[in-house]
């Protein structure tokens, strides 16, 4: 039950995160005109990854796409690439995770296959989230650098009668959406990976238990060689009768391949 909840919650959180990454990528407000300590203008500028916009005080808004590919800064291209990679990985992760959900039955899909798919989608969500966070952070760093450069320019070359105003840009809403969305996708991915551990069936049998016969101190290992190696008739993960009752807490499983994420 807990595994299903963790997997379901991981899926929902990732879904919200990826929706947020898509929204952030499409948003025009990656950078907005800095209004602090600036002359108040009747025009407000803001820029996105794909176009720049100008909103006049009257409400009239005009947006122009970046119709060049080669003329754009390399950093902007890198941010675009990171965001697109994040969206693509996230979308594939969502598709995979839908089939991996424990609550959804698809034919005779085994738990081991679902566990693998859950792990795959989890990793994809983690990478997707990291791509989004990296993309937004690169853009934010670019803004900070440009902000201080333009601030320095504002206070130089003012000896003449005519002053020029440099438009400075600061963090736009899309950056915060991107950071939050990337974080959610990352958290969702981690949750999927955690859920995967619970979904993974035991690949080894229960640990051998010592039985003490009256008057003797003989250790009895049920299942013999087969039980300890996993070869032979027990490869299908059937539980071998161990001849003794035990509580759930006493059952110890060896680490499976899904434990190291």
């Amino acid at each position: 039950m807990a595994v299903t909840a963790c997997q379901g919650l991981g899926f929902v959180v990732s879904l919200i995160g990826i929706a947020g990454i898509i929204a952030a990528t499409c948003m025009d407000q990656w950078s907005t005109q800095d209004l602090y300590n600036n002359p108040v203008t009747a025009v407000f500028n803001y820029q996105g990854l794909w176009r720049s916009c100008v909103r006049e005080s009257s409400g009239f808004t005009e947006c122009r796409g970046y119709f060049t590919l080669l003329g754009l800064p390399a950093m902007l291209q890198a941010v675009r690439a990171l965001m697109i990679v994040g969206i693509v990985l996230g979308a594939i992760g969502l598709l995979v995770s839908i089939f991996a959900l424990k609550c959804i039955r698809i034919g005779s899909m085994e738990d081991s296959a679902k566990a693998n798919m859950t792990l795959t989608s989890g990793i994809m969500f983690i990478v997707s989230g990291l791509c989004a966070i990296a993309g937004v952070s690169v853009f934010a760093n670019m803004l900070v650098t440009n902000f201080w450069m333009s601030t320095a320019n504002m206070y130089t070359g003012m000896g003449g009668m005519v002053q020029t105003v440099q438009t400075r840009y600061t963090f736009g809403a899309a950056l915060f959406v991107g950071w939050v969305a990337g974080g959610l996708t990352l958290i969702g991915g981690v949750m999927m990976c955690i859920a995967c551990r619970g979904l993974a069936p035991e690949e080894t049998n229960y640990k051998a238990v010592s039985y003490h016969a009256s008057g003797h101190s003989v250790a009895y290992k049920p299942g013999g060689f087969k039980a300890s190696t996993g070869f032979g008739s027990n490869t299908k993960n059937k539980k071998i009768y161990d001849g003794g009752a035990r509580t759930e807490d006493e059952v110890q499983s060896y680490p499976s391949k899904h434990d190291y994420v």
Partner: antibody, heavy 118, light 113 residues
């Protein structure tokens, strides 16, 4: 069609207050911004204030402390409250609609004369 | 505040001739975001309110005759009347439509020679 009609002007003593009105028709004050511009006799135009469609306001820094722009959306009427009037406030006061493009003023009223004199 | 300086203060031009009015702002009116200059030109005839002629420094308002044109960028702007007509006798004002407070130039009185 778009029409702006100013009223409330007249002769007033220095230090007194006056409220000008601008009745707008043919458009809504919640869709377009409206400016107040004044012109002293034989002088040039002086921008006074604006109230934008969203309700935000901007003023001429020299007049900001004494003048207040407001509107009544239900009456589609704009107001200019003028306090502590001085002789130099004597002028024709125009209200003008903000154009949708370029921040220009595309429709003007005929103006109302305000004379500040003792 | 932005200072708008118009020149000349008055201008006399013969009918059919070209009239040129200049306007200079103390700061650039060019918006980097859309590469538009937020300068507006108005015409005011005696006893009438001003009339919008040109916005964005060079875009003519609808209904304004083609003989009126605007040019310039940054801080220096020009209003040109290609062929002066009798009805063009008026005072012409430029306006900063970029920075608050919006400011007008002192005006240029255009007369017929």
């Amino acid at each position: 069609q778009v029409q702006l009609v100013e009223s409330g002007g007249g002769v007033v003593q220095p230090g007194r207050s006056l409220r000008l009105s601008c009745a707008a028709s043919g458009f809504s004050l919640t869709t377009y911004g409206v400016h107040w511009v004044r012109q002293a006799p034989g002088k040039g135009l002086e921008w006074v204030a604006v109230i934008w469609a969203g309700g935000s306001t901007n003023y001429n820094s020299a007049l900001m402390s004494r003048f207040t722009i407001s509107r009544d959306n239900s009456k589609n009427t704009l107001y200019l409250q003028m306090n502590s009037l001085r002789a130099e406030d004597t002028a024709v006061y125009y209200c003008a609609r903000a154009a949708y493009y370029g921040n220009g003023l595309d429709y003007w009223g005929q103006g109302t004369m305000v004379t500040v004199s003792s | 505040d932005i200072v708008m300086t118009q020149s000349p203060d008055s201008l006399a031009v013969s009918l059919g001739e070209r009239a040129t009015i200049n306007c200079k702002s103390s700061q650039t009116l060019l918006n980097s975001g859309n590469q538009k200059n937020y300068l507006t030109w108005y015409q005011q005839k005696p006893g009438q309110p001003p009339k919008l002629l040109i916005y964005w420094a060079s875009t003519g308002e609808s209904g304004v005759p083609d003989r009126f044109s605007g040019s310039g960028s940054g801080t220096d702007f020009t209003l040109t009347i290609s062929s002066l007509q009798a009805e063009d006798v008026a005072v012409y004002y430029c306006q900063n439509a970029y920075f608050y407070p919006f400011t007008f130039g002192g005006g240029t009185k255009l007369e017929i020679k």
